[in-house]
Amino acid sequence: ARPLEEALDVIVSTFHKYSGKEGDKFKLNKTELKELLTRELPSFLGKRTDEAAFQKVMSNLDSNRDNEVDFQEYCVFLSCIAMMCNEFFEGCPDKEPRKK
Amino acid sequence: ARPLEEALDVIVSTFHKYSGKEGDKFKLNKTELKELLTRELPSFLGKRTDEAAFQKVMSNLDSNRDNEVDFQEYCVFLSCIAMMCNEFFEGCPDKEPRKK
C-alpha cells in the first residue's frame, strides 16, 4: 500500500483501537478519547492534561451533543489538526515545495 | 512520532508533493490531483482512469468552484474515503474490536 493509503488505514484502526473499549463500540466516550489523545496525539495535547481541557476538547468535537465522538466527528477533528500542521508547513520557507 | 501523528504528516506532505508542481503551490489543479490519485490512492480510483471520472472527482472536491482543490477540500475528501473505509471496517466481524 502507498503511504497515503496506509495513513488512512491508521486513522481508521486507531479509532477502533480505542472506541472498542467501553460502551458503544463504534464511538469514543470521554475516557476512550482521553486515552487516544494521550497515547496517539501527545504533540497535540502538549501539557493540557487537566480534566477541564479534556472536557473542552470533547465538547468541541461532539457536534451532535451525545457525549461521544463518532467516526465522522473524529475525522473532522483530524482534518483540523492536519490544517494546523499545513499552516505551519506553508509558513516555513525551508519546508515549502519549490516556488512555482 | 506515533503512527497517528505520522499519518497526519503523510497527509500534509503528500498534498504538497503534488500541489507544488504547477500554478498555485498551495492548491492542486486537475493535473496535480490526477497524479496524486493515480500514484498515491490507486485503490480508491480502481479502474476509473478515464477523463470523465477525474472531472467528476474534481468537481466533487472543488466545493468553492475555483477549479482547484485546496488543503481543506483535500481533507474533506480524505475524510470521506476514511469514512468509506470505516464502514467497511465496521461491517467486517473479524476486523471489529471485541464486543462491549
Epitope: G23, K30, A52, Q55, K56, M58, S59, N60, S63, N64, R65, D66, N67 | -
Partner: antibody, heavy 120, light 107 residues
Framework: QVQLQESGPGLVKPSQTLSLTCTVS?????????WNWIRQFPGKGLEWIGH???????NYNPSLKNRLSMSRDTSKNQFSLKLSSVTAADTAVYYC?????????????WGQGTLVTVSS | DIQMTQSPSSLSASVGDRVTITCRAS??????LNWYQQKPGKAPKLLLY???RLHSGVPSRFSGSGSGTDYTLTISSLQPEDFATYYC?????????FGGGTKVEIK
C-alpha cells in the same frame, strides 16, 4: 461572572415572526460553550428550542425546526432566535442559556427570561 | 425524543425533612442527568449535573443518584430557601428534554 440578557418584543401577532436576542457579558463566545434557547410555557413545562456552538454548529429541536432560525454575532457577543408563523401555543417565557462543556452538557447560566405573548 | 417523567408532581414537607424526588427516562441516559431548582418569577438554577456532581456554590445537602433510566434527587435536611420547583433534564442526546417538575411546598 457570566450574565445573559434576553431582549425583544413582548407581544407578537399570530402568523408573524418572533425575534429575540441574547447578549452575553462576562464571557466571550469561546469555542468551549454552546448557547441555547429554552422556553417555559404558562403551565410551567420547559422545552429546549435549540443551540449554536463550536464553529457555528447549530442543532434545533425537530418539533420546531421548520420554523426556527438561529444565528450569532461574535463581535457583539450576541446570539439570536427567530421563530416564524407563531400561534398562541408559542406564548411562553423565553430563556437564553449557556451550556457547559462538562458531562451531560448542563445549562449552567441562564438569562432572567422574557415573556412573549402571541395575541392579535 | 427521550421522555422524562418526574414524581411526585408536588409534595409538602417541613424544614429539616429529608426529601426525595425521582425522575424516570424513557430509555437509558447513561447518567447524563441534570437537576435544576426554580423559584417563582426566576430562571431555573443548576444544582447537579451528571447525576451526582454538585454545581459550584450548591449546598452539600443536595445529592443525586441513579443509573440507566431511574434517578433521584435528595435534599437531606430541607431548609426554608429550598421550597421551590425542581426539574430533571437529560443531557444524553438531542433534543434535550425536561421532566414536568416537582413543586416542594411548606407543610
Amino acid at each position: 461572572q457570566v450574565q445573559l440578557q434576553e431582549s425583544g418584543p413582548g407581544l407578537v401577532k399570530p402568523s408573524q415572526t418572533l425575534s429575540l436576542t441574547c447578549t452575553v457579558s462576562g464571557d466571550s463566545f469561546t469555542n468551549d460553550y454552546y448557547w441555547n434557547w429554552i422556553r417555559q410555557f404558562p403551565g410551567k413545562g420547559l422545552e429546549w428550542i435549540g443551540h449554536i456552538g463550536y464553529g457555528g454548529n447549530i442543532n434545533y429541536n425537530p418539533s420546531l425546526k421548520n420554523r426556527l432560525s438561529m444565528s450569532r454575532d461574535t463581535s457583539k457577543n450576541q446570539f439570536s432566535l427567530k421563530l416564524s408563523s407563531v400561534t398562541a401555543a408559542d406564548t411562553a417565557v423565553y430563556y437564553c442559556t449557556r451550556e457547559s462543556f462538562y458531562d451531560g452538557y448542563p445549562f449552567d447560566y441562564w438569562g432572567q427570561g422574557t415573556l412573549v405573548t402571541v395575541s392579535s | 425524543d427521550i421522555q422524562m417523567t418526574q414524581s411526585p408532581s408536588s409534595l409538602s414537607a417541613s424544614v429539616g425533612d429529608r426529601v426525595t424526588i425521582t425522575c424516570r427516562a424513557s430509555q437509558d441516559i447513561r447518567n447524563y442527568l441534570n437537576w435544576y431548582q426554580q423559584k417563582p418569577g426566576k430562571a431555573p438554577k443548576l444544582l447537579l449535573y451528571y447525576t451526582s456532581r454538585l454545581h459550584s456554590g450548591v449546598p452539600s445537602r443536595f445529592s443525586g443518584s441513579g443509573s440507566g433510566t431511574d434517578y433521584t434527587l435528595t435534599i437531606s435536611s430541607l431548609q426554608p430557601e429550598d421550597f421551590a420547583t425542581y426539574y430533571c433534564q437529560q443531557g444524553n442526546s438531542l433534543p434535550r428534554t425536561f421532566g414536568g417538575g416537582t413543586k416542594v411546598e411548606i407543610k
